[in-house]
């Protein structure tokens, strides 16, 4: 009943709880002298299903047969309507529609840890939509029985609150769960197990790692476990990896030596435990231990390259460049690089430690034979030095690679190809491809890039530090013993017509011809490698086509003579620049009149 029902009653037959698909009869009847004030024909009883009127009757009672009720709870309310008055609530009832419980499936029990309690889980099957009580029963040796009930609407877990002990690890226990509601009952199949089957150890704790003599090769992992643990699984991985290394160990007694860790690497370690070889289940993985392995001295050798620049008749500038070791080669934090410069005949040597840079520049005499050695040092030691004899890399003309070309290869890549030198190609020990941004001033501060190529290769794809619309000076060196030959070419990965033309800054007269001088186009406006300049001229106020002179682009050139102008005629001159993609717009216009004598 949903209220006091003083004025009447609502009865439900056969029951307030019905099976899905059943029909119920609902009767609403007024108690004596509870109808409308006037004679009873005017009593109008109305039956509501939630907020909807579903039936009515004039008189003292209303009978209604209801079908098709949905799963769950439906509220019916009976009201009385009298002429010219509000409806009065008489009484109401809730009807619960559901199904009998299905047989609980997959009953399984577990005890978490040796000191834990036995808890079981099962699958309820489809929702009954009714109050359903679950009873879990456990029977053991010596006729011992435990029982626990669950009145939660969605019950699929119960903890007995009892602890199984390892005194008789092979003793059998049997669990069964029974579901009961108003429409029926059903029991699971029994689940039989022993202590060893259901005890799931607690995950290991207090995990530590020790490196004997700060060496990665002598590493021991320690942990604590529950007393009966027989097996352990260890898994570990570098923190930046998704793949685990896995190790199974028996009777480890809380320690295990790891032999294959890499130096100077952060690892994540986890451990899991089990009581028996083939019974029971593994514990959850322990909390992760994160630890960095110690450094080891670097392996590998630095990739070193150099550049020579003539200063004057007695001095030359040497710029050394080297690449960082890979993480696996550095095996620690590189603290400094050691550069040793030695004059081979006189034995003079100087050593310098370089920090924070991967280049070094010095000035040495042009005479003598010079060699350098460069190594990388961390807290444990140094890499093997890379030794290079300083030579004139382009001196041997016969070693110069032939037919060097540079072509764009997709976004920000340049494919460099060449032919072996004319001199015995088998003499070549390796090729080095070097590239740097082209700066008209030949700026030595521009970063240098290089890669090494085996002697049988005749191409290399360069992609490191390559930007679109920038021209690169590319050199291919062929090295053989203490000799080298080189060839160079300009190349770009992407190009378009230059954004502006050269700016003419002066026109001077010399013996009947003129010399035009210009300022280079700013690098950011060249939009790739320049191929030609064009000088245009025409008589002022003339509508004729201009004449032009095309000059191949050379980095250092910024003037050119023209000797085909007529004296005492005023000309307008301008310049453009061309890349493989097209011609720039005009540079500035200059007027000039040649003063020389007429023929």
């Amino acid at each position: 009943k949903i209220d006091a029902c003083k004025r009447g009653d609502v009865t439900v037959k056969p029951s307030h709880v019905i099976l899905l698909g059943s029909t119920v009869n609902i009767t609403c009847s007024l108690k004596p002298r509870q109808g409308c004030f006037h004679y009873s024909r005017r009593n109008k009883l109305i039956l509501y299903k939630f907020d909807r009127r579903i039936n009515f009757h004039h008189g003292h009672s209303l009978n209604s047969q209801v079908t098709g009720l949905p799963l769950g709870t439906t509220l019916f309310v009976c009201k009385l309507a009298c002429i010219n008055s509000d409806e009065i609530q008489i009484c109401g009832a809730e009807i619960f529609v559901g199904v009998a419980p299905e047989q609980p499936q997959n009953l399984s029990c577990i005890q978490k840890g040796e000191q834990g309690t036995v808890a079981c889980t099962w699958e309820r099957g489809r929702d009954t939509h009714l109050y359903t009580e679950y009873t879990l029963q456990l029977s053991g040796p010596k006729n011992l029985t435990w029982q626990k009930q669950c009145k939660d609407i969605y019950c699929d877990y119960l903890d007995f609150g009892i602890n199984l002990t390892p005194e008789s690890p092979e003793s059998n226990f049997t669990a069964k769960v029974t579901a009961v509601n108003s429409l029926g009952s059903s029991s699971s199949l029994p689940s039989t197990f022993t202590f060893l089957d259901i005890v799931r150890p607690l995950p290991p704790w207090d995990i530590r790692i020790k490196f004997q003599k700060a060496s990665v090769s002598r590493c021991t992992l320690y942990w604590r476990d529950e007393g009966l643990v027989l097996l352990n699984r260890l898994r570990y991985r570098p923190s930046n990896s998704r793949l685990w290394n896995m190790v199974n160990v028996t009777k480890a007694k809380g320690r295990h030596d790891l032999l294959d860790l890499k130096p100077f690497t952060e690892y994540e370690f986890q451990i899991s435990s089990k009581l028996h070889l083939y019974k029971g289940s593994w514990s959850d993985w322990s909390e992760s231990l994160r630890a960095q392995t110690p450094e080891e001295e670097p392996t590998g050798m630095l990739d070193v390259w150099y550049m020579k620049r003539h200063i004057d008749y007695s001095r030359q500038q040497i710029s050394l460049f080297w690449k960082n070791l890979s993480v696996s080669e550095a095996r620690g934090k590189i603290l400094h690089y050691q550069v040793t410069l030695q004059e081979l005949t006189g034995g003079k040597a100087m050593t310098q430690n370089i920090t924070g840079h991967t280049s070094w520049t010095t000035v040495i005499p042009r005479t003598g034979n010079w060699a350098v050695a460069v190594s990388a040092a961390n807290s444990k030691g140094s890499s093997l030095p890379t030794r290079i004899n300083i030579m004139n890399l382009c001196e041997a003309g016969l070693l110069a690679p032939r037919q060097v070309s540079a072509n764009s290869e997709g976004m920000d890549n340049i494919l460099v190809t060449w032919q072996p030198p004319r001199k015995d190609p088998s003499a070549v020990q390796e090729y080095v491809v070097e590239w740097r941004e082209l700066h008209p001033g030949g700026d030595t501060q521009v970063p240098l890039n290089w890669l090494r190529s085996r002697p049988y290769n005749v191409s290399a794809l360069i992609s490191e530090n390559i930007k679109s619309y920038i021209c690169y000076e590319i050199r291919v060196y062929a090295l053989s013993g203490d000799q080298g030959g080189c060839s160079s070419i300009l190349g770009n990965s992407k190009h378009k017509a230059p954004l502006s033309g050269p700016h003419i800054n002066a026109i001077t007269e010399e013996k009947g011809s003129i010399l035009i001088s210009w300022n280079s186009i700013p690098v950011q406006e060249q939009m790739g490698c320049l191929l030609h300049y064009r000088i245009y001229w025409k008589e002022r106020d003339s509508n004729s086509q201009p004449q032009l002179c095309e000059i191949p682009y050379r980095v250092s050139q910024n003037s050119h003579p023209i000797n085909s102008l007529q004296p005492r005629v005023t000309y307008v001159l301008w310049m453009t620049a061309l890349t493989a993609a097209g011609e720039s717009s005009h540079g500035n216009e200059r007027e000039f009149c040649l003063q020389g004598k007429a023929n």
Partner: nanobody, 125 residues
Framework: QVQLQESGGGLVQPGGSLRLSCKAS????????MSWVRQAPGKGLEWVSA????????DYADSVEGRFTISRDDAKNMLFLQMNSLKPEDTARYYC??????????????????WGQGTQVTVSS
């Protein structure tokens, strides 16, 4: 699924009579109270009459009381509305509906999908 099919409408002179029928299917007709509802051109739904699930009680809107009679035949799943002394203001499209979807209290338009096409009644001289 629930289906309701009305028939019997037509053109009639003021003062004349018509008998509307409704054939129900797709549900247990005898357990449901039923209603007649009408909709005049450009107007909302207006409840006209109802009969309870036993057929023993009937209700009428004030505007039709004494002129219209509702009845049902559970054996044939039929609902009827006998309309006498028709007036021009009775002109409308007439629908039958479950009482729970449209009663003298309110119409629940979310169930209107169950309704038939209705039958047109025109009262005119």
């Amino acid at each position: 699924q629930v289906q309701l099919q009305e028939s019997g409408g037509g053109l009639v002179q003021p003062g004349g009579s018509l008998r509307l029928s409704c054939k129900a299917s797709g549900f247990t007709f005898s357990t449901y109270a039923m209603s007649w509802v009408r909709q005049a051109p450009g107007k909302g739904l207006e409840w006209v009459s109802a009969v309870n699930s036993g057929g023993l009680s009937t209700d009428y809107a004030d505007s039709v009381e004494g002129r219209f009679t509702i009845s049902r035949d559970d054996a044939k799943n039929m609902l009827f509305l006998q309309m006498n002394s028709l007036k021009p203001e009775d002109t409308a499209r007439y629908y039958c509906a479950k009482y729970e979807d449209c009663s003298d209290y309110m119409c629940h338009r979310d169930r209107a999908g169950y309704w038939g096409q209705g039958t047109q009644v025109t009262v005119s001289s």
